[in-house]
């Protein structure tokens, strides 16, 4: 679609803009129906009101916008584009609003948007250009500093025939728009793996939350570029062991705190390096709480209390000696 002449200063990816203008402009800072507004706090809350669209007449002063607990379903291009633009909007919370589709350019024309929370929405269709707004190989930098995407995995029967991890990562990496991102939360998304290139392209990250996923290994993930990383949450995953390369990279990060609780650590001969590292490192928070899950004979043993004699691997029997 093309922009109308009255909206010619905006890109064609924002078809809502031209049509979202009331015929008689509202009072400049009128509060939309079904919302609560505080001009002093620069805050608008339209919470648990079963809204199916983003309100059109949002006050220009809004800095914090809560649209949680609604039924938005889809965020089209330019969903927040207004004339004049919402130039002050810095924090946008859309959690729990039944969004399953976020289109390219959904957050365009929000020049001050620093915090975005899309948690608890079953995002079956997250456009690669949801955050970059453009399919250019290098987009204009996004102002986003915090992106909260906890529990955005749709139910299994609603997932498309593609990797959910891949869809999310494509949106994070498109156009290198999120180079300034400092906090990324991806907890509770059933992630089985972390695509290897994702962290390398988010060099400003300070806080990364991958807790409560299904990560089995970090073998192909590189933390080397994340020199500013301060916290890495890996609790409640399916990690069995951290290998030397990962241990060395984590140890090399100057400000890092790593959280590893509630993983099914396998305490066999492959765990020896990690146990040695744990005893020496200061980067793991609550390291004294880490316990073995396997093998059975080692269950609930504290990793820090293990020595090399405890960590053996059953020899692999030649086929002629194996029993069925």
């Amino acid at each position: 679609s093309s922009p109308t002449s009255s909206a010619s200063s905006f890109s064609s990816s924002a078809p809502f803009l031209a049509s979202a203008v009331s015929a008689q402009p509202p009072l400049p800072d009128q509060c939309p129906a079904l919302c609560e507004c505080s001009e002093a706090a620069r805050t608008v809350k339209c919470v648990n009101r079963n809204l199916t669209e983003v309100p059109t007449d949002l006050p220009a002063y809004v800095r914090n916008l809560f649209l949680t607990g609604n039924q938005l379903a889809v965020l089209p291009a330019g969903a927040f584009a207004r004339r004049p633009p919402l130039a002050e909007l810095a924090a946008l919370n859309l959690s729990g609003s039944r969004l399953d589709e976020v289109r390219a350019g959904a957050f365009e024309h929000l020049p001050s948007l620093r915090q975005l929370d899309l948690s608890h929405n079953p995002l079956a269709d997250l456009s690669p250009f949801a955050f970059s707004g453009s399919n250019a190989s290098v987009s204009a930098p996004s102002p986003l500093v915090e992106l909260i995407l906890n529990h955005i995995v749709p139910p299994e029967d609603e997932r498309q025939n593609r990797s959910f991890e891949g869809m999310v990562v494509a949106a994070l990496l498109a156009g290198r728009a999120l180079q300034g991102l400092r906090r990324l939360e991806l907890a509770s998304n059933h992630f089985l793996y972390l695509p290897r290139d994702v962290l390398a392209q988010l060099p400003s990250l300070r806080h990364l939350d991958l807790s409560n996923n299904s990560l089995v290994s970090l073998t192909y993930v590189s933390f080397r570029n994340l020199t500013h990383l301060e916290s890495l949450h890996l609790e409640d995953n399916a990690l069995k062991v951290l290998h030397n390369g990962t241990l060395a990279e984590l140890q090399g990060l100057p400000h890092i705190r790593v959280f590893l609780d509630n993983n099914p650590w396998v305490c066999d001969c492959h765990m020896a390096d990690m146990v040695t590292w744990l005893k020496e490192t200061e980067v793991v928070q609550g390291k004294d709480r880490l316990t073995c899950a396997y093998p059975e004979k080692m269950r609930n043993r504290v990793l820090l209390e293990l020595n090399s004699a405890d960590l053996d691997c059953d020899p692999i029997l030649p086929p002629s000696l194996q029993t069925s």
Epitope: S19, A20, T52, E53, A124
Partner: antibody, heavy 120, light 111 residues
């Protein structure tokens, strides 16, 4: 039974105003978004305007923007279309229609229409 | 704006025979979550009525001789066996974005 009944149409001179109403019954009016759609004589259907269930969202076709205003009174189960600065090309049958949402919705109930004729 | 082009603009069908109407959009009106294309029938002297929602879902109370298919830009409405009461003008409509637009209509007559 879902019923939508439009009223307020008539013959009006160019530049004048008219207010259409749509009385709804047989469903919980405040749970539904509402549209106005028009049909010029012998022509096809043209979407005019939309208002969300709680009057938080309003959208207009470019052809009527700045001249028409959609509104509703949920306590009276009534939808309105205030039409100002009317033009000959606004001559049409105006239908009100119900939807569950703007983009994920569809026009699932229609009124019989009210005729607006703009002529000098 | 998204343009919907219907073909044919009119068709004359013998009762009991099938009929098919095409609707082509100037850009995709499908996502992986939903298809934003709907079909209506306007019988002579009446308002339109919803037949098919989201490309292929039959509206309650509509006879099952009507069916819809398609995704992306190409959509089809089929009537398996045309009956006399099916005469009127058929419209497709998208809800992908504002403005919502309709096809120009296809007039179905009985031979």
């Amino acid at each position: 039974e879902v019923q939508l009944v439009e009223s307020g149409g008539g013959v009006v001179q160019p530049g004048r105003s008219l207010r259409l109403s749509c009385a709804a019954s047989g469903f919980t009016f405040s749970n539904f978004g509402m549209h106005w759609v028009r049909q010029a004589p012998g022509k096809g259907l043209e979407w005019v305007a939309y208002i969300s269930s709680g009057s938080t969202s309003f959208y207009y076709a470019d052809t009527v923007k700045g001249r028409f205003t959609i509104s509703r009174d949920n306590s009276k189960n009534t939808l309105y279309l205030q039409m100002n600065s009317l033009r000959a090309e606004d001559t049409a049958v105006y239908y009100c229609s119900r939807t569950n949402s703007l983009l994920r919705g569809f026009f699932d109930a229609w009124g019989q229409g009210t005729t607006v004729t703009v002529s000098s | 704006d998204i343009v919907l082009t219907q073909t044919p603009l009119s068709l004359s069908v013998t009762p009991g025979q099938p009929a098919s109407i095409s609707c082509r959009a100037s850009q995709s009106v499908s996502s992986s979550s939903y298809t934003y294309l709907h079909w209506y029938l306007q019988k002579p002297g009446q308002p339109p009525q919803l037949l098919i929602k989201s490309a292929s879902n039959l509206e309650s109370g509509v006879p099952d001789r009507f069916s819809g298919s398609g995704s992306g830009t190409d959509f089809t409405l089929k009537i398996s066996r045309v009956e006399a009461e099916d005469v009127g003008v058929y419209y497709c409509q998208h809800s992908w974005e504002i403005p919502l637009t309709f096809g120009q209509g296809t007039k179905l007559e009985i031979k």
